[in-house]
Interface confidence: medium
Amino acid sequence: FERTRSLQDPCSNCPAGTFCDNNRNQICSPCPPNSFSSAGGQRTCDICRQCKGVFRTRKECSSTSNAECDCTPGFHCLGAGCSMCEQDCKQGQELTKKGCKDCCFGTFNDQKRGICRPWTNCSLDGKSVLVNGTKERDVVCGPSPADLSPGASSVTPPAPAREPGHSPQ
């Protein structure tokens, strides 16, 4: 089958990194600089992606694969294949049309990207607020009052670490 296909279409023999040159009796010609073909049998090569401005080259273009971009410091990738770069904000902020704005009271953002999200409503689970929320951090919910027996600590202390080779006293 392969032999039949190549007899019917000489271009199927052209490997990645080349194009099938119709002007030259369908010989395989190497892709021009700044272009690539990632599959065999192509009639043209594709223009390499240029990582310019806020885009930074993560992987150089080769004759068989496109360039890959990421974003310069202070920006992060958005979209498939880092099609856009969006400005970073500080934790406790979100990006708006007017730039980075602090999270409103009752919301937080613990990343440099994304939007401010509402604090967890502990009471919905019948729990109480153990640690108050901030612009950068969500609230920490404590156990529900029913879980607390008189004199019980609201936070369970961690178990002491056991050293290897030592049995408990």
Partner: nanobody
Amino acid sequence: EVQLLESGGGLVQPGGSLRLSCAASGFTLSAEDVGWVRQAPGKGLEWVSAILDSGGSTYYAESVKGRFTISRDNAKNTLYLQMSSLRAEDTAVYYCARVVYHAGGGVTYDYRGQGTQVTVSS
């Protein structure tokens, strides 16, 4: 009609120099991405050097970096390839080529001249 006429090839000893010229007609060199491809005996075509982005950047194959220099004279509509420290493996027919950008986004290239033979031998 687009025409590319190469000249300047010849027989040279290893370590020697040559300057190839490509006189273009039918289009303006300065407005195009142009360069040099070569074909060694029994081998396929290889890109040697190019001027891209209307002169904004140059490309050199790894095998010729530091030895070959591409340039052009816009007034004469001529492309040059200065070749120095020539080696036996540089022996090939050298063609002037124009990169062609297609409407669908594809890229190919066109070379119309007969090429100029460069032979490096002692």
